[in-house]
């Protein structure tokens, strides 16, 4: 099966790599603009230069292109705890990330929030915190994992999944509050 190509991809595929087909004259292939620049004017004819201009401050193009405008630089979302790792340049967008001992939780493909890595109190670190994943904890005896925190078995209700992990404690407890810890 031939993959479906958009009009622009169809037009570009007629020209060799690094060139694009002139929008008004499909017998002319113009050289694409380098990253950090955008298309100001198409080339007037075969073998003639494309008029490319450098992106203005606050905008960029990260690859060779024939865009009529540069792309606006992204802004890091302070309300999501994001910090700027590297600022925007004419050929690279802003890079946003999280502070040390934090990880990214992706709300959507294009949006992440920074959360503190779990410290595994009352447990041990099974897998260290990574850029896009929280620490994975293993809990000590008498504790069970809830929302990646080690919680005392005294907080385990019979209806919850913790009953398997806390079963000995629950059977010994018979309703007393302080019995879940070992």
């Amino acid at each position: 099966l031939v993959p479906h190509l958009g009009d622009r991809e169809k037009r570009d595929s007629v020209c060799p790599q690094g060139k694009y087909i002139h929008p008004q004259n499909n017998s002319i292939c113009c050289t694409k603009c380098h990253k950090g620049t955008y298309l100001y004017n198409d080339c007037p004819g075969p073998g003639q230069d494309t008029d490319c201009r450098e992106c203005e401050s606050g905008s960029f193009t990260a690859s060779e292109n024939h865009l009529r405008h540069c792309l606006s630089c992204s802004k890091c979302r302070k309300e999501m705890g994001q910090v700027e790792i590297s600022s925007c340049t004419v050929d690279r967008d802003t890079v946003c990330g999280c502070r040390k001992n934090q990880y990214r939780h992706y709300w959507s493909e294009n949006l992440f929030q920074c959360f503190n890595c779990s410290l595994c109190l009352n447990g041990t670190v099974h897998l260290s915190c990574q850029e896009k994943q929280n620490t994975v904890c293993t809990c000590h005896a008498g504790f069970f994992l809830r929302e990646n925190e080690c919680v005392s078995c005294s907080n385990c209700k019979k209806s919850l999944e913790c009953t398997k992990l806390c079963l000995p404690q629950i059977e010994n407890v018979k309703g007393t509050e302080d019995s879940g810890t070992t």
């Epitope: 939780h105 992706y106 709300w107 959507s108 493909e109 294009n110 949006l111 929030q113 959360f115 929302e147 990646n148």
Partner: nanobody, 122 residues
């Protein structure tokens, strides 16, 4: 077909409370992050709150922090927004939205409800 149906809006006095609900169908509710977004009259969209698929992580806009609580019941395929200490500036149409995880083409949300109007006035 994905459907998000909000309910619970209405007229409330300043300082009052409301609980919005969003019944979801047509997709595996438990597999997606969900959120509430609002649009005040003549203004742009504002993110209100998000909740992750497990109900463990939440996000709140500064304007609603400490007053609104987002929650979900995965067994009922329902998203909630408990709104307390309501103010006139909370007046808006509130939309339930599914957050997009793949092939989003720059968008944060891929499906929205029709919205429910919340009016805070004395």
């Amino acid at each position: 077909e994905v459907q998000l149906l909000e309910s619970g809006g209405g007229l409330v006095q300043p300082g009052g409370s409301l609980r919005l609900s969003c019944a979801a169908s047509g997709f595996t509710f438990v597999a997606y992050n969900m959120g509430w977004v609002r649009q005040a009259p003549g203004k742009g969209l504002e993110w209100v709150s998000f909740i992750d698929m497990y109900g463990a992580k939440t996000y709140y806009a500064d304007s609603v922090k400490g007053r609104f609580t987002i929650s979900r019941d995965n067994s009922k395929n329902t998203l909630y927004l408990q709104m307390n200490s309501l103010r006139a500036e909370d007046t808006a149409v509130y939309y339930c939205a599914k957050l997009c995880l793949m092939d989003c083409s720059g968008d944060i949300f891929d499906y929205w409800g029709q919205g429910t109007l919340v009016t805070v006035s004395s």
